[in-house]
């Protein structure tokens, strides 16, 4: 690993392929910016179980991105 910290992406590593739908409290999409050059899909889990990053290339992530974009635009 390089010793320096690169960017300020919120996700570490590629992320999980899927999260149980029943466990999802909310989903946030972070689009590429000066801080992080990739799209990030962050799932907040129910019952204070923290957060998980979804692999943005996964089927579930693509569905979530589509859903969020439909809602916003």
């Amino acid at each position: 690993f390089p010793m320096f910290k690169r960017g300020r992406c919120l996700c570490i590593g590629p992320g999980v392929k899927a999260v149980k739908v029943a466990d999802i409290e909310k989903a946030s999409i972070m689009y590429p910016s000066n801080n992080c050059d990739k799209i990030e899909v962050i799932i907040t889990l129910k019952e204070n179980k923290g957060q998980r990053c979804l692999n943005p290339k996964s089927k579930q992530a693509r569905l979530i991105i589509k859903k969020v974009e439909r809602k916003n635009f």
Epitope: R6, C11, I12, G13, P14, V19, I43, Q51, C53
Partner: nanobody, 126 residues
Framework: EVQLVESGGGLVQAGGSLRLSCAAS????????IGWFRQAPGKEREGVSC????????YYADSVKGRFTISSDNAKNTVYLQMNSLKPEDTAVYYC???????????????????WGQGTQVTVSS
Amino acid sequence: EVQLVESGGGLVQAGGSLRLSCAASGFTFDDYAIGWFRQAPGKEREGVSCCSSSDGSTYYADSVKGRFTISSDNAKNTVYLQMNSLKPEDTAVYYCAATQGLTIATMWNPVSYDYWGQGTQVTVSS
């Protein structure tokens, strides 16, 4: 079956160095973030260093910054923790832990990790 096996602990004098190893098996190394934690007697488990072998991110707790270095050998599926300028307060059992989907907001929380090694004892004498 996922397995994490730590080694390299021992007794060392203050100011000395140790290199811990965490050998991983049973999962695709690049898909996981692997972190190092420690637990001193009577204290909570605390995060020491965290990284991901796929994107090269490295993070350190303030207490070890500049003294500890995390690295990996992907061919050997092994993560290392090089510990220099050791202090008596570094005495603890050191664990490596692995998970997927980690965020920087939750990387120091042991609950965020799915798999743990059995730990290796590090004792620093003054």
